[in-house]
């Protein structure tokens, strides 16, 4: 699985799960979050070579019709495959809030 | 919705569904094929902007850092989002099979 | 500079609803929390709920829940206001505005309010 | 609810002068969840004033805000013509938002 026990122990240009920290004031301007002030959220990048991690069957055509016809711009792309969710901390005027926000933290990739 | 109907009509260099005819023996090297000899997979491309068919609360998320951070690499891309399979004829020896291939034809696209 | 632009005037009959949109433009919609207040005739500032648009945690005014719902298009970068089982006291300006960052919060730039009428 | 109960109800004073708007509150806020907003007729409120004392931006250093707990006040060193119009505290401390009634401030 292009998770973070392969992708964080490899260096990959190939599609794999990269490390990317949130700051939620600094980098999405929300100030409204009390807890966490961050996350490592991640993402996904990197090459779909020719069945490297395919999702579909139309991603695996993709990439073999690309390596066949390198001079193709359709070609699958990296994009996260697992999602999991963050617990925060808001505040409703003096009263705290516990929320959980869905599909937050990528987990692993795949070539869709 | 990212699909045929919309982006076929209108020029969008972002997310989109494209048009992209496969034949078979010439562009997969599949011979096994008797009928169709080639077919409309389509294939999703295009700039995934702040806001552009965010796929889940990561990818509105990452495009939302993405505007607020543009020297960051890290960017939502343009994906697959319906599929539909490809009825094929091809020959056992001389006895002709029917099959259904799944997840053929992409139909619509999103930012994932 | 953010900018709130209301949709127009409305006349409604009493027992129906209405629906006020309020478009963002100036800054990012994702980063923003919006509040709904209106004002009755030579009245005063009525809070009625926030919406933050990007995770859609909205708050309400107790007296207003279960008749008012506060969502968002970050498509359009719109909020809207739904009031329904309206009467005739909800003759007022109804205002959306951004506030200061959280959800309940000073509101720093207002829209330019929708006259909502109710008469039979 | 937080009760904000403002005043005068209406305050006649002239240009020049200094005016001086209370707002108490029917629990304690805290220090810094009240706020100012200046209404002329026919146009939207606009924010002076937020956490009790921080001026918003924009907003001539003649207005300032002071208070905490329960008693908060708007002080307007030198009233200018413009200055002359309704003027609402707002509390942000409790779920619902409330608003003072509102203090009247015309020419004398």
């Known amino acids: 699985a292009l998770d973070a026990a392969y992708c964080f122990r490899n260096v990959q240009d190939n599609c794999c799960l990269r490390p990317l920290y949130i700051d939620f004031k600094r980098d999405l301007g929300w100030k409204w979050i009390h807890e966490p002030k961050g996350y490592n959220a991640n993402f996904c990048a990197g090459a779909c070579p020719y069945l490297w991690s395919s999702d579909t069957q139309h991603s695996r055509v993709l990439s073999l019709y690309n390596t066949i016809n390198p001079e193709a711009s359709a070609s699958p792309c990296c994009v996260s495959q697992d999602l999991e969710p963050l617990t925060i901390l808001y505040y409703i005027g003096k009263t705290p809030k516990i929320e959980q926000l869905s599909n937050m933290i990528v987990k692993s990739c795949k070539c869709s | 919705a990212l699909d045929a109907a919309y982006c076929f009509r209108n020029v969008q260099d972002n997310c989109c569904l494209r048009p992209l005819y496969i034949d078979f023996k010439r562009d997969l090297g599949w011979k096994w094929i008797h009928e169709p000899k080639g077919y409309n997979a389509n294939f999703c491309a295009g700039a995934c902007p702040y806001l552009w068919s965010s796929d889940t609360q990561h990818s509105r998320v990452l495009s939302l850092y993405n505007t607020i951070n543009p020297e960051a690499s890290a960017s939502p891309c343009c994906v697959s989002q319906d599929l539909e399979p490809l009825t094929i004829l091809y020959y056992i020896g001389k006895t002709p099979k029917i099959e259904q291939l799944s997840n053929m034809i992409v139909k619509s696209c999103k930012c994932s | 500079q953010v900018q709130l632009v209301q949709s127009g005037a409305e006349v409604k009959k009493p027992g129906s609803s209405v629906k006020v949109s309020c478009k963002a433009s100036g800054y990012t919609f994702s980063s923003m929390v919006i509040s709904w207040v209106r004002q009755a005739p030579g009245q005063g500032l009525e809070w009625m709920g926030g919406v933050i648009p990007i995770v859609d945690i909205a708050n309400y005014a107790q007296r207003f829940k279960g008749r008012v719902t506060i969502t968002a298009d970050e498509s359009t970068s719109t909020t809207y206001m739904e009031l329904s089982s309206l009467r005739s006291e909800d003759t007022a300006v109804y205002y959306c505005a951004s506030t200061l960052g959280l959800v309940l919060d000073a509101m720093d730039y207002w829209g330019q309010g929708t006259l909502v009428t109710v008469s039979s | 609810e937080t009760v904000l109960t403002q005043s005068p109800g209406t305050l006649s004073l002239s240009p020049g002068e200094r005016a001086t708007l209370s707002c108490r509150a029917s629990?304690?806020?805290?220090?810094?969840?009240l706020a100012w907003y200046q209404q002329k007729p026919g146009q939207a409120p606009r924010l002076l004033i937020y956490g009790a004392s921080s001026r918003a931006p924009g907003i001539p250093d003649r207005f300032s805000g002071s208070g905490s707990g329960t008693d908060f006040t708007l002080t307007i060193s030198r009233l200018e013509p413009e200055d002359f119009a309704v003027y609402y505290c707002?509390?942000?401390?409790?779920?619902?938002?409330?608003f003072g009634q509102g203090t009247r401030l015309e020419i004398k």
């Open positions: 707002q509390q942000y401390a409790d779920s619902p938002i409330t």
């Open positions: 629990q304690s806020l805290g220090s810094s969840y």
